[in-house]
C-alpha cells in the first residue's frame, strides 16, 4: 500500500533574472527512491536524478538549471516564460510513483517578489497518484 506523502515548496514567486529552488520531500514511507524526475508544465523534462547514476540535466536547460540542493533543482536566470507548473515525480520501490506540484510565478524585477534562493513560498502536501 502506498502511504507516502510529498511535501513541496508549493506556490512560489521569484524575480526575473534571479534564481529559485524547486524542492520536494517524500515522507511517511519506507519505500526506496530509485529516481526523481523534474518536469515542466509543457511535458518537458528538466532533469532526472537517478539514485545510482546521478543527475542528467536536459540539454535545453543545461545552461540555467543546476542540480540540487539534495534531490531539488535550482532554476537560474529566470524569465517570464518560466512562470507555470513544475512537477517532481518520485519513482520508488516497492510503492510506485509519487508526484508533487509546484507553481512558480516569475515577477518583473521591479516587483516585490523574492530573489535568489527560492522567493516566497507556501508548503503543500501531495498524496500519491
Amino acid at each position: 500500500m502506498m502511504t507516502g506523502t510529498i511535501e513541496t515548496t508549493g506556490n512560489i514567486s521569484a524575480k526575473k533574472g534571479g534564481s529559485v529552488i524547486l524542492q520536494c520531500h517524500l515522507s511517511s514511507t519506507m519505500a526506496q527512491v530509485t529516481q526523481v524526475n523534474w518536469e515542466q508544465h509543457d511535458h518537458s523534462l528538466l532533469a532526472i536524478r537517478n539514485a545510482e547514476l546521478g543527475w542528467h540535466i536536459y540539454p535545453a536547460f543545461k545552461d540555467r538549471v543546476a542540480p540540487g540542493p539534495g534531490l531539488g533543482l535550482t532554476l537560474q536566470s529566470l524569465t517570464m516564460n518560466d512562470t507555470g507548473e513544475y512537477f517532481c515525480t518520485y519513482h520508488t520501490y516497492p510503492d510506485g510513483t509519487y508526484r508533487g506540484r509546484i507553481f512558480l510565478e516569475v515577477l518583473e524585477s521591479s516587483g516585490g517578489g523574492g530573489a535568489g534562493g527560492g522567493g516566497h513560498h507556501h508548503h503543500h502536501h501531495h498524496h500519491h497518484h
Epitope: T34, Q35, N37, S44, N50, G54, H56, Y58
Partner: antibody, heavy 121, light 107 residues
C-alpha cells in the same frame, strides 16, 4: 576511443549458467559511467538486462533479476554477466554497452559488437 | 513496465525520399527517448537522445521529435547507408525498455 568486446561460450546447456565478459579498452571502468548488458533474441528487439555502476552498485531488469549477476574485474578492466537456469528463450545476441548518464541520460553511446549465445543440449 | 510500440514494422522507401518512423509509449515518458540504428550483424548505434538531440557525428538528415507518448524519427533524404532497423528506447522509468523496431528497406 572507447571500445568494448564481448567474449564467452557460444553454446550453453539448458538449466546451465551463461557466462560472458566484456573487455573495455580506452577507458578505466572504475573511473566513471555505468556498464550495461543488453540482449537481442534472433530476429527480435532489444532487451535491457542490467548494469554495474563504476562505484560497484548494480541494477537489474526485474524480469531477470532472480537469475542475473553482473560484476566487475578491476584488474582486467572488464565486467561480466552471469545468467543462471537458462532455457531456449535465453538464446540471443548479447551486447555490452556504456551509458554516459550525465550527458545522454539513459541512452547507451558505446556498444560491443555482440556475441551469439545459443541454449541447446 | 513501459511498452514502446513502433510502426510500421517495415517501411519501403526509395533513396532520396523522406522516411518517417513512429514510436508510441504506453504511458507518458516526457522527452526521455533515444533512437538507435542497427545494421545486419552490427551493434546498435546511438542516433538521438532526449527525443530530439543528435548524438555526436550523426548527420543532420536524422531528426527526432515528440513528447509525452508519441515520438517520431525522420530521415529527410535516405542514403544507401541508412537502410537498417531503427529502435526507440525510453528512460523515463528506471527499467529501460526498447521498441520492437522498424526496418527501413529499399523500395
Amino acid at each position: 576511443q572507447v571500445q568494448l568486446q564481448e567474449s564467452g561460450p557460444g553454446l550453453v546447456k539448458p538449466s546451465g549458467t551463461l557466462s560472458l565478459t566484456c573487455a573495455v579498452s580506452g577507458y578505466s571502468i572504475t573511473s566513471g559511467y555505468s556498464w550495461h548488458w543488453v540482449r537481442q533474441p534472433p530476429g527480435k528487439g532489444l532487451e535491457w538486462i542490467g548494469y554495474v555502476h563504476y562505484s560497484g552498485s548494480t541494477n537489474y531488469n526485474p524480469s531477470l533479476k532472480s537469475r542475473v549477476t553482473i560484476s566487475v574485474d578491476k584488474s582486467k578492466n572488464q565486467f561480466s554477466l552471469k545468467l543462471s537456469s537458462v532455457t531456449a528463450a535465453d538464446t540471443a545476441v548479447y551486447y555490452c554497452a556504456r551509458m554516459d548518464y550525465g550527458n545522454y541520460g539513459g541512452a547507451m553511446d558505446y556498444w560491443g559488437q555482440g556475441t551469439l549465445v545459443t541454449v541447446s543440449s | 513496465e513501459i511498452v514502446m510500440t513502433q510502426s510500421p514494422a517495415t517501411l519501403s522507401v526509395s533513396p532520396g525520399e523522406r522516411a518517417t518512423l513512429s514510436c508510441k509509449a504506453s504511458q507518458d515518458v516526457r522527452t526521455a527517448v533515444a533512437w538507435y540504428q542497427q545494421k545486419p550483424g552490427q551493434a546498435p548505434r546511438l542516433l538521438i537522445y532526449s527525443a530530439s538531440y543528435r548524438y555526436t557525428g550523426i548527420p543532420a538528415r536524422f531528426s527526432g521529435s515528440g513528447s509525452g507518448t508519441e515520438f517520431t524519427l525522420t530521415i529527410s533524404s535516405l542514403q544507401s547507408e541508412d537502410f537498417a532497423v531503427y529502435y526507440c528506447q525510453q528512460y523515463y522509468s528506471t527499467q529501460w525498455t526498447f521498441g520492437g523496431g522498424t526496418k527501413v528497406e529499399i523500395k
